[in-house]
Interface confidence: low
């Protein structure tokens, strides 16, 4: 169940879709990765206040469990429901490879 | 793929199964929940120290770029692998009605 | 790491204005810039910010579109399409989510 | 737009006494508060952030906690150079800015 797309906080303050440029030594992975030298990595952030896009019941849950007792509960956060895949050429023993990662870059976010 | 469970914060710091004893007004359900009058819930809360539980490699993306650039990619962040099945007994017009809810109790957590 | 406001100066109701934030000792890709404003004996005004990595703004509900926020590779600008009075004030840019560091400021005086 | 109320307006204290400034939030903001002082002349200087994270260089005297709606700033054996207006600060999320408190001004005796 996707819940309230209105973010209560002004726009873009809430859970969405954001692109981190990102080196290959900014990831570590300059020595086993030839290709792209530079990643678009696509992550979600941002705040999830009550029920903005609240994944399923247990983040229903928590947002009334986190009101309730914050120092207990966390607020929901803002994490990928679904993947973008992203080919990489790695570098190999004899010599490289096209190694396809489903679960690289985030495609779209939700409330958890 | 699931990294490491050793947690550098010290034992019960990091991204772990929780209990939280709920009451049906507690979580908002009094008006169509019957039973159970009391919820464990089960949640996932902690800190995702570096690589502690990755989900992903998404998850290994964003430790290393909140590493390099802590005030625009935040953390991972501790959030359900699994769920454990729930069945509410529900009230409805014409009497009462057990309804499964597959997403409600977090069975195993991970960093995401 | 240091920023610095420029710009600031007496004009008139009406007339625009630029202001701009000059960064040195960090990459301003990496993060989020504000600006705030405080009014002579008033307390601090936020009025908005922008990612220096992709450029992406966020206002103050007040704003109104009367400020416009802009960057370039090392600075961030403040434009004041139409000062009037009430925009007589100190200009402070400051660096993060959380503004760990910030200019002097600079003044803007609105006077007919 | 979350509206940031902080009390008292004003507080005195002796040196080496305790000072306590709440900020209330009128809605949940978890644990996304900072705390800034400022001297006349100067722009703010961040003291803590994530509610309770103290910044670089800033001296334990300065405790922040809370959590949700309800935040509070102590500072304990005050000196005079903690003479200062103090603003609450939300910064919802991890992604942005936002509003200030109206300010707390500590004179200290």
């Known amino acids: 169940a996707r819940n309230g797309d209105h973010c209560p906080l002004g726009p873009g303050r809430c859970c969405r879709l954001h692109t981190v440029r990102a080196s290959l030594e900014d990831l570590g992975w300059a020595d086993w990765v030839l290709s792209p030298r530079e990643v678009q990595v696509t992550m979600c952030i941002g705040a999830c206040p009550s029920q903005f896009r609240a994944a399923n019941m247990h983040a229903q849950i928590k947002t009334s469990l986190h009101r309730l007792k914050p120092d207990t509960v966390p607020a929901p956060c803002c994490v990928p429901a679904s993947y973008n895949p992203m080919v990489l050429i790695q570098k190999t023993d004899t010599g490289v490879s096209l190694q396809t990662y489903d679960d690289l870059l985030a495609k779209d976010c939700h409330c958890i | 793929a699931r990294n490491g469970d050793h947690c550098p914060l010290g034992p019960g710091r990091c991204c772990r199964l929780h209990t939280v004893r709920a009451s049906l007004e507690d979580l908002g359900w009094a008006d169509w929940v019957l039973s159970p009058r009391e919820v464990q819930v089960t949640m996932c809360i902690g800190a995702c120290p570096s690589q502690f539980r990755a989900a992903n490699m998404h998850a290994q993306i964003k430790t290393s770029l909140h590493r390099l650039k802590p005030d625009t990619v935040p953390a991972p962040c501790c959030v359900p692998a699994s769920y454990n099945p729930m069945v509410l007994i529900q009230k409805t017009d014409t009497g009462v009605s057990l309804q499964t809810y597959d997403d409600l109790l977090a069975k195993d957590c991970h960093c995401i | 790491q240091q920023l610095k406001e420029s710009g600031g100066r007496l004009v008139t109701p009406g007339t625009p204005l630029t202001l701009t934030c000059t960064v040195s000792?960090?990459?301003?890709?990496?993060?989020?810039m504000s600006w705030v404003r405080q009014a002579p004996g008033k307390g601090l005004e936020w009025i908005g910010d922008i990612y220096g990595g992709s450029g992406t703004t966020d206002y103050a509900s007040w704003v109104k579109g009367r400020f416009t926020i802009s960057k370039t590779s090392t600075t961030v600008d403040l434009r004041i399409a139409s000062p009037t009075t009430e925009d007589t004030a100190t200009y402070f840019c400051?660096?993060?989510?959380?503004?760990?560091?910030w200019g002097p400021g600079t003044l803007v005086t609105v006077s007919l | 737009d979350i509206v940031l109320t902080q009390t008292p307006a004003s507080v005195e204290a002796a040196v080496g006494g305790t000072v306590t400034i709440k900020c209330q939030a009128s809605q949940s903001i978890s644990s996304y508060l900072a705390w800034y002082q400022q001297k006349p002349g100067q722009p703010p200087k961040l003291l803590i952030y994530k509610a309770s994270t103290l910044a670089s260089g800033v001296p334990s005297r300065f405790k922040g906690s809370g959590s949700g709606t309800e935040f509070t700033l102590t500072i304990s054996d005050l000196e005079c150079a903690d003479a200062a207006t103090y603003y609450c600060r939300c910064i919802y999320g991890d992604s942005y800015g936002a509003a200030f408190g109206g300010g707390t001004e500590v004179v200290v005796q």
């Open positions: 000792g960090f990459s301003l890709s990496d993060y989020y």
């Open positions: 400051g660096r993060g989510i959380t503004a760990d560091i």
